[in-house]
């Protein structure tokens, strides 16, 4: 999943959780598969750069092997760099694993703008801050990118946590996460938590951008407030779901809901921004110039180039709407709805701020695949992904980034007939060609 | 077609108040399309942005002369109008008055300028 | 901050020669640049905006190039009324604040 807009979200210590804790409320969720509770030892254990990707520190072959990997639920493949490249500190050395075995297979990934293609074979995996266990893994070793890797992000490969049909060359490769829950007895479920950083930071706190958790096997309870509220997984490919509204501060874009999921509503955790179809986008960027009327941005500022920059600490959050996406809910007929504050959708970018100023990327664009929900949604919640279940719940992040205004919410449920209609069926055509728009 | 034209006093004394407006001919200073600009030239020297507006009245200064900055609109009579408060001999300058165009990016039309003198 | 330098200070060229001025940006502003004329006793004159596009009534011997940290502005032949100083400008954060120092390029 390209973050930068599909990064790899092509950003580390987290400190305290940003922002202010909201009370919990009562758990109202029937029981969950997997362990309940405290996962300590995956907490904060990813870290990042601001628009760069969240990455996981993994470790592949005997003797390990330590590697930072990028956290895409957008992609199927786990793949790491495995040759010398400008922008790789280290990379997976195959032949100093006594426990690689090859696969005798090529593999070949493109990308609207660039690509990477490598060697198939299996290797030991294990996560230091996850689940302690070691599983056999289908590994893509990189040998040749273009245009994949980013300078100064720190991760030196990709784990795609999304499912086998969309895996590359076929959905004949088992993705790591199905081989680590056949191979062991972790609960086929995982959550994420994505701290932005929420403020520019300067080059020595950009060593320590962002942080966040990924949790494998279960929820952590610490890392929300509220409750969860589940939508149905529409396929298993993508993360897909089905979104049937769309509201800008409370003001209904009044859109057929089938023009939101046209031609996917997909959860990503490899893009950085809200990708919205072309319709959709226009739409909202409108009602959010509407809303912010007092001020004036440039042309670009809107098309996610120009950056916008206020004296520190002085962004005027309040001139910017909150953005409301209604999800598909787990019983008929009823909806709920996740609000992201502009703290989420204004992305500060910390390489030209000064002290003297805060400066902001708007991180909502246009897609040509579909809705994306990514790290600019993500950040806002904590996400179950319960794969057992086949569905996906949210949450309000216990890190998300707010004022004493307003808060990143997920509320329900709400009464919306006919759902079943905002999915877009896909004609029935060869699908190999739908991950190469990954912009 | 559109023009724009700054005036006010020449000459200020310093530690007084540096008034100008610039009126705007030709065209309405109340379209949702542009922005409205300060920019000072001392002489001799490159140009140094002092702020703009919008016709709602949300003003962006320059940080190093936000605390003495005050830059108005007044859309009745097609003006705004900058003050600069506390000059000294460095306030000195050719002040000159723009639209900011272009996608609300580039000043792609100025006013002639008038030089401001601060001297006792 | 983004600073912007021009080079050179001074350009000294006869009418007719083709004259090349640089801006370098101290990061990426990925094309959002202008360049403006300014002669002896005028307002600056927008040239270019959006680093290679004319402004409207800008001769076409008026050309700027360039994205990312790097720009040039090229006069293909220089007339007599081009003597004067130019200044880029960065917009790529906004408000427009930045201007380089100018070039100034005058008659051999």
């Known amino acids: 999943t390209h973050l930068g807009i599909r990064l790899p979200l092509r950003s580390g210590l987290a400190g305290p959780p940003l922002g202010l804790r909201l009370p919990r409320e009562t758990d109202e969720e029937s029981e969950e598969p997997g362990r309940r509770g405290s996962f300590v030892e995956m907490v904060d254990n990813l870290r990042g750069k601001s628009g760069q990707g969240y990455y996981v520190e993994m470790t592949v072959g005997s003797p390990p092997q330590t590697l930072n990997i990028l956290v895409d639920t957008g992609s199927s493949n786990f793949a790491v760099g495995a040759a010398p490249h400008p922008f790789l500190h280290r990379y997976y050395q195959r032949q100093l694993s006594s426990t690689y075995r090859d696969l005798r297979k090529g593999v070949y990934v493109p990308y609207t703008q660039g690509k990477w293609e490598g060697e198939l074979g299996t290797d030991l995996v294990s996560i230091p801050h996850g689940p302690n266990v070691t599983v056999r893994a289908n590994i893509a070793a990189i040998t040749e990118s273009d245009k994949f890797f980013i300078n100064g992000s720190n991760w030196e490969g990709i784990l795609g946590l999304a499912y086998a049909e969309i895996a590359r060359p076929d959905d004949s490769l088992e993705p790591f996460f199905d081989s680590l829950v056949k191979q062991t007895h972790i609960p086929n479920i995982f959550s994420l938590q994505l701290c932005g950083a929420g403020f520019p930071l300067n080059q020595t706190e950009a060593l320590a951008s962002v942080g966040g958790s990924m949790i494998i096997g279960g929820i952590d309870h610490s890392l929300y407030t509220g409750r969860l509220w589940y939508t149905p997984i529409r396929r298993e490919w993508y993360y897909e779901v089905i979104i049937v509204r769309v509201e800008i501060n409370g003001q209904d874009l009044k859109m057929d809901c089938k023009e939101y999921n046209y031609d996917k509503s997909i959860v990503d955790s490899g893009t950085t921004n809200l990708r919205l179809p072309k319709k959709v986008f226009e739409a909202a960027v409108k009602s959010i110039k509407a809303a912010s009327s007092t001020e004036k941005f440039p042309d670009g500022f809107w098309l996610g180039e120009q950056l916008v920059c206020w004296q520190a600490g002085t962004t005027p959050w309040n001139i910017f709407p909150v953005i409301s996406l209604y999800l598909m809910g787990e019983v008929t007929n009823q909806s709920f709805r996740i609000t992201i504050l502009p703290q989420q959708y204004l992305r500060p970018v910390e390489d030209v701020a000064t002290s003297q100023d805060d400066c902001y990327k708007f991180a909502v664009s246009q897609s040509s695949t579909g809705t994306v929900m990514g790290a600019v949604i993500m950040e806002g919640f904590y996400v179950v992904f319960d794969r057992a279940r086949k569905r996906i719940g949210f949450a309000v992040s216990a890190c998300h980034v707010h004022d004493e205004f307003r808060t990143a919410a997920v509320e329900g449920p709400f009464v919306t007939a006919d759902m079943e209609d905002c999915g877009y069926n896909i004609p029935q055509t060869d699908e190999s060609t739908l991950m190469t728009g990954r912009a | 077609q559109l023009q724009l034209q700054e005036s006010g006093p020449g000459l200020v004394k310093p530690s007084e108040t540096l008034s100008l407006t610039c009126t705007v001919s030709?065209?309405?200073?109340?379209?949702?399309?542009?922005?409205w600009g300060w920019i000072r030239q001392p002489p001799g020297k490159g140009l140094e942005w002092i702020g703009m507006i919008y016709y709602s009245g949300s003003t962006w200064y320059n940080p190093s002369l936000k605390s003495r900055v005050t830059i108005s609109v007044d859309t009745s009579k097609n003006q705004f109008s900058l003050k600069l408060s506390s000059v000294t001999a460095a306030d000195t300058a050719v002040y000159y008055c723009?639209?900011?165009?272009?996608?609300?990016?580039?000043?792609?039309?100025w006013g002639r300028g008038t030089l401001v003198t601060v001297s006792s | 901050e983004i600073v912007l330098t021009q080079s050179p200070a001074t350009l000294s060229l006869s009418p007719g020669e083709r004259a090349t001025l640089s801006c370098r940006a101290s990061q990426s502003v990925s094309s959002y640049l202008a360049w403006y004329q300014q002669k002896p006793g005028q307002a600056p004159r927008l040239l270019i905006y959006?680093?290679?596009k004319r402004a409207t009534g800008i001769p076409a011997r008026f050309s700027g190039s360039g994205s990312g940290t790097d720009f040039t502005l090229t006069i293909s032949s220089l007339e007599p009324e081009d003597f004067a100083v130019y200044y880029c400008q960065q917009v790529y954060t906004w408000p427009p604040r930045t201007f380089g120092g100018g070039t100034k390029v005058e008659i051999k």
């Open positions: 030709g065209g309405s200073i109340s379209s949702s399309s542009y922005y």
């Open positions: 723009a639209r900011v165009g272009h996608g609300v990016s580039y000043f792609d039309l």
């Open positions: 959006g680093a290679s």
